[in-house]
């Protein structure tokens, strides 16, 4: 398939050069119903013949299909065809391809490492606080409190496995019942989805990329929130997760298994352990009310220690305090007993940057948080850049077709389930749902994967992380085996229940619609993405936590009116869109409310004013800073060096005329030439992998 239209082609070729043709630009499947059509039988689209790339005729009067911002962009190849290259050019192109692949893998490696360090940073900053959340006695009686603690702790430590392991140790020490642990596990499931949402924020520079990336990331959030919304009340009423998992645990005579294989960690650990090493036990000890642990540092200093178990004589107030009568005596004055003590002798220090600094955990955490976010952002930008240059023409077509195309009729419905399995498998390999979904996010952003396809992959990722937990549970010591396995199974069945709720019937795939809605809002008002993150992962959980501490009467007193208002708004919204005639004229739209209650425009003005002071200081900043700047304020001309905001603003201004926005150009170089940014002569120097 020729990536460029042949100039000599007088006849229109519907297969090759038509916008919307199956081979060229797959359309997003219909949101409301599962498509059974194969690649060749897509919904009919308005066919516009694509004129040669130097023509601007196609910039005007776009067909309605292309106006859909969720359609994947076509990244056409702007390079010279392989057949047209001389030997030197072919060799050069081959090595360029190899170089790109090495760079891509390198940046991907540091991307995953930065996620690991980001988790460590969060644990250093909020780990002890997270541990203290667990020591709250109200968790036992209040499932809502358990849920928000699960969210907050997982957000604070950036690792659901850490919060889950704390819960497991608390259950096996009888500090927590399985019943009380289930809402915490549900919360941990929500909390873990913040990571890829943070990763999506890094793609804020390009509106359409950000729209897709943010929606792709938040589809995970919405799935988790909606699952909890339905399944937590069901669990509280029926205890079905507790009962099912208890039956499973009791029906099998499990033997201690092997540890879950650390596949990705094997590669990343050598690097991350040079940056920082943490003593994760400290958080668990704080959760278990160990007073001594509160003064311990999370930063691991000694990596090699010798533990010597010995018996020592210790005095006790009376013989009643003796470990056993046979190990008790008196010297005539004091009572003595034998106590088993473990002497820990430090042998070798750890080899990481912070080992000799003796900085407080908060300082180390803050440093690592900033650095890891910068590396994460930098790697993400580079991954997107490299992928953008590699995924063009036939490569893009093959990849996009492979990932986003359904099986032929009548097996189209199976595609999603295969994607769930792929997601689970990949997550099992990388041992982290955060890593998998975070790696998925830029691919959604640049348009390689549709949100419709990313959704089952994400659901699979949720399953994958629980299978890892089940394996880890099977490797637990005898006393913790039952509780850890039951909790891991609760996690597993919770996700299975969620999938059954929000996946099999296309109509119930609410998370996709909600994520797209949020994506659209966030693409228009980019500050809303940060607002969403703060509200959903911090403010709401903290508010519920605070109200729960005040007592159930306060919680109900505040919660019931809030829930009532939300239900009322949703019902009204549903009636407005489905059957507005049943409503009084005034209630048929939201115009009866003041503008600030029904639109983000006035809020946008407030945020823009508030962040106005940053705009002047933002000048001549690096691309990373520019992205952060664009996120806070839609600053139009602030980043002249990187031009990212400026380019976007020009594109926005141009949207009054029915001209293609840059993201809908079939060829990136056309859009640049049309806007006078890239000299036409440069457009042919690109080299593609094929």
């Amino acid at each position: 398939m020729a990536p460029w239209p042949e100039l000599g082609d007088a006849q229109p070729n519907p297969d090759k050069y038509l916008e919307g043709a199956a081979g060229q630009q797959p359309t997003a499947p219909d949101k409301s119903k599962e498509t059974n059509k194969t690649d060749n039988t897509e919904a009919p689209v308005t066919k516009i013949e694509l004129l040669p790339s130097y023509s601007t005729a196609t910039l005007i009067d776009e067909p309605t299909e292309v106006d859909d911002p969720w359609n994947l962009p076509t990244l056409q190849d702007s390079g010279i065809k392989w057949s047209e290259r001389d030997t030197k050019g072919k060799i050069l192109c081959f090595f360029q391809g190899i170089g790109r692949l090495i760079l891509l893998l390198g940046f991907l490696y540091f991307f995953v490492c930065s996620l690991d360090i980001l988790s460590s940073a969060f644990q250093l900053v909020g780990g002890k606080m997270a541990g203290q959340f667990f020591s709250n006695s109200s968790i036992m009686s209040n499932p809502l409190l358990g849920l928000v603690i699960g969210v907050l702790v997982t957000v604070l430590v950036q690792s659901s496995s850490t919060s889950t392991s704390i819960v497991v140790s608390m259950v096996s020490s009888s500090l927590l019942t399985v019943r009380a642990a289930i809402p915490i596990i549900m919360g941990a499931n929500i909390g873990t989805s913040i990571t890829n949402t943070i990763v999506a924020l890094m793609q804020v520079g390009d509106r359409s990329e950000f729209r897709r990336a943010f929606a792709g990331a938040t589809v995970h959030d919405f799935f988790n929130w909606l699952s909890v919304l339905v399944l937590l009340p069901v669990e509280v009423a029926t205890h079905y997760l507790e009962i099912i998992t208890q039956l499973i645990v009791e029906s099998f005579h499990f033997k201690n298994g092997e540890d879950a294989p650390d596949l990705l960690k094997v590669i990343t650990k050598p690097f991350t352990k040079l940056i920082v090493q943490l003593d994760k036990k400290v958080i668990s000890q704080i959760a278990m009310n160990d007073e001594k642990a509160k003064n311990k540092s999370l930063v691991k200093i000694w990596c090699k220690t010798f533990t010597n178990k010995t018996q020592i004589n210790v005095t006790v107030p009376s013989t009643a305090n003796c470990t056993s009568p046979s190990l008790c005596w008196t010297d005539g004055i004091q009572n003595w007993t034998m106590k088993n003590v473990t002497y820990k002798e430090n042998i070798a220090k750890c080899q990481h940057i912070f080992v000799n600094f003796h900085l407080p955990d908060l300082a180390v955490g803050t440093i690592l948080l900033i650095l890891s976010l910068l590396v994460l952002c930098g790697c993400l930008i580079m991954i997107v850049k490299i992928l953008g240059s590699v995924l063009k023409g036939q490569v893009a077509t093959v990849i996009k077709k492979t990932i986003n195309t359904d099986f032929p009729f009548p097996f189209a419905w199976l595609t999603g389930y295969l994607a769930i399995l792929v997601g689970a498998g990949m997550t099992f390999i990388v041992q982290s749902s955060s890593v998998f979904t975070s790696a998925l996010t830029p691919l959604i952003g640049i348009g390689v994967i549709t949100i419709e396809r990313a959704y089952p992959l994400t659901l699979g990722s949720n399953i994958g992380t629980t299978t890892t937990a089940i394996l880890a549970a099977l490797a637990s010591p005898g006393n913790a085996l039952r509780s850890s396995l039951q909790i891991a199974l609760c996690h597993f069945f919770f996700n299975i229940s969620g999938i059954l709720l929000w996946y099999p019937i296309p109509f119930t795939r609410l998370p996709i619609r909600m994520a797209k809605g949020l994506g659209n809002i966030s693409a228009k008002y980019r500050w809303f993405a940060v607002f969403y993150l703060i509200i959903f992962f911090f403010l709401i959980p903290l508010t519920v936590f605070g109200l729960s501490l005040a007592g159930w009467r306060v919680l109900v007193g505040v919660g019931v009116p809030v829930v009532f208002i939300i239900i009322l708004v949703l019902c009204l919204r549903l009636l407005q869109s489905r059957c507005p005639r049943v409503l009084p004229k005034k209630l048929q739209n939201w115009n009866f409310l003041p503008l600030w209650m029904r639109s983000l425009k006035p809020w946008d003005a407030v945020v823009s004013k508030f962040t106005g002071c940053f705009q002047m200081r933002c000048c001549c900043c690096c691309r990373v800073c520019c992205r952060a700047c664009c996120l806070l304020c839609d600053c139009p001309k602030c980043c002249r060096c990187s031009k990212c905001c400026e380019d976007l603003e020009e594109a926005q201004e141009g949207q009054d005329v029915p001209v293609k926005a840059p993201e809908t150009f079939d060829n990136i170089t056309i859009s640049r030439e049309a806007q006078g940014e890239v000299p036409a002569s440069d457009s042919k120097t690109e080299c593609t992998a094929l």
Epitope: S324, P325, C328, W329, T330, D331, G332, I333, Q334, N335
Partner: antibody
Amino acid sequence: QVQLVESGAEVKQPGESVKVSCKTSGYTFTTYNVHWVRQAPGQGLEWMGAISPGSGLTSYAQKFQGRVTLTVDKSTSTAYMELSSLRSEDTAVYYCARGGFRLGSMDYWGQGTLVTVSS
Amino acid sequence: DIQMTQSPSFLSASVGDRVTITCSASQNVGTSVAWYQQKPGQSPKELIYWASNRFTGVPSRFSGSGSGTDFTLTISSLQPEDFATYYCQQYSSPPLTFGQGTKVEIK
């Protein structure tokens, strides 16, 4: 070698007090407790109390509580036992003994001091 | 207080005999028991501590056993210098208490 040397025999009248000394040598005085045991003529051994020279802590048998006082002089490595309000039944040989290290057994004993209470 | 009861109170034996003295505690004392030997006109000497550990310089013919409430001192082959009174003592909990003693005489 470890030695505990007690003061000489005493003859006392009922109601009086007696103070028996026990000079130790051959070990670190403050490390081991000093016990006092008495033996009435033709009778068995009876523990009176003990003192820790290092801390000054004392412990007395209920029977002698309030009548016996145990003290030490670290400078001379000497332990003292004072028994007040003497009665005829207090006639006995009074032994000082070194306690085993952190034990209630007695590994080295003094030669004993005979205290006779008679009117 | 813990009572220590020794039996027998008197024991007649010949040189070379195997002699066993028993001591019974009124409650569990673990292994916190010591045995002493006292010859007439002399102060007591420690033989055994921790129910079975021989004190420095004590001949190997002396051995101790038992735990909980029942303890035994065994002289495997009685020697002329072994004719004396033997006391058991508990140091499980204060106050320290002794048995009433067992006098070993020449038959």
